[in-house]
């Protein structure tokens, strides 16, 4: 059985300020079991953008129904984009663990750039 891959098809995405940004992510397998999270940045200080398991993310919606059986699409949309949202976003798969989930594999990242709002 092939090991799960995390696919972020777009290397970069450009969005006008005020619009929504769709960041695409797909898994190639349902295994291992565990949540996905989206982060901005890749270092120790990376910012949590979305956690499938818990949390409040008012500007983030999922493109597909993540709880749907056999779902492999973990794309998200971030509303009302501002220049402060620019950065590289990573879709990360975690393996269910006890007491904590363990990071399993990360996508290659999608760089979001923000264009000035059209006048």
């Amino acid at each position: 059985e092939d090991e799960l891959q995390v696919i972020q098809p777009e290397k970069s995405v450009s969005v006008a300020a005020g619009e929504s940004a769709t960041l695409r992510c797909a898994m190639t397998s349902l295994i291992p079991v565990g949540p996905i999270m989206w982060f901005r940045g890749a270092g120790a200080g990376r910012e949590l953008i979305y956690n499938q398991k818990e949390g409040h993310f008012p500007r983030v919606t999922t493109v597909s129904e993540l709880t749907k059986r056999n779902n492999l699409d973990f794309s998200i949309s971030i509303s009302n984009i501002t220049p402060a949202d620019a950065g590289t976003y990573y879709c990360v798969k975690f393996r269910k663990g006890s007491p904590d989930d363990v990071e399993f594999k990360s996508g290659a990242g999608t760089e979001l750039s923000v264009r000035a709002k059209p006048s």
Epitope: F39, G41, A44, G45, R46, E47, G55
Partner: antibody, heavy 117, light 108 residues
């Protein structure tokens, strides 16, 4: 407005323990890494420890094995448990919010820890 | 561990003049270099990150430059509120995050 308020500092003897707290408000605490930085009297800044959003912890070599960083997301509070304190740990301890760029954009006012016999 | 060396240790400047000071890294940090300002009795304040990007609310008179191992912070026209200690910090992806020893900018 982002606010970070440290507490728990004080005067202790060498070998004793102290637990610092940092209460955060004005941002979604669960979404950010947070860190401790210290400053000995009249000296420069020294990074001490960081805890990521997923709970991974990092320490400076000078405190590894003696200090433990933790966070309680339900209380939006950061902690630093300091054991086996030494005179050289005497400093003002600041907590700070970490950006995704790994820089520290908001700081508390600090709490003074004095280790002396 | 990356060691950051700041120079000079103290800089005496008159208000309105230009102040330039440097930070040298013991190994390359790319553009991952930040600058902080600290006034007596206060917490540090982030000024610059990524070597040349001003943090939110920082006046345009503060500018950073450099890459690799050599970095510079310039204050184009010193205001009275700019007299303080300035620290550089490398902010590569993973700890330890090291600071330079600081440059004190004092009134001439």
């Amino acid at each position: 407005d982002v606010q970070l308020v440290e507490s728990g500092g004080g005067l202790v003897r060498p070998g004793e323990s102290l637990r610092l707290s940092c209460a955060a408000s004005g941002f979604t605490f669960t979404n950010y890494a947070v860190t401790w930085v210290r400053q000995a009297p009249g000296e420069g800044l020294e990074w001490v420890s960081l805890i990521s959003v997923t709970g991974t912890t990092y320490y400076a070599d000078s405190v590894k094995g003696r200090f433990t960083i933790s966070r309680d997301n339900s209380k939006s509070t950061l902690y630093l448990q300091m054991n086996g304190l030494r005179a050289e740990d005497t400093a003002v301890y600041y907590c700070a919010k970490v950006t995704w760029k790994n820089v520290f954009d908001y700081w508390g006012l600090g709490t003074l820890v004095t280790v002396s016999s | 561990e990356i060691v950051l060396t700041q120079s000079p240790g103290t800089l005496s400047v008159s208000p309105g003049e230009r102040a330039t000071f440097s930070c040298r890294a013991s190994q390359t940090v790319g553009s991952k270099l930040a600058w902080y300002q600290q006034k007596p009795g206060q917490a540090p304040r982030l000024l610059i990150y990524d070597a040349n990007t001003r943090a939110t609310g920082i006046p345009a008179r503060f500018s950073g430059s450099g890459s690799g191992t050599e970095f510079t912070l310039t204050i184009s026209s010193l205001q009275s509120e700019d007299f303080a200690v300035y620290y550089c910090q490398q902010h590569t992806d993973w700890p330890p995050y090291t600071f330079g020893g600081g440059t004190k900018v004092e009134i001439k």
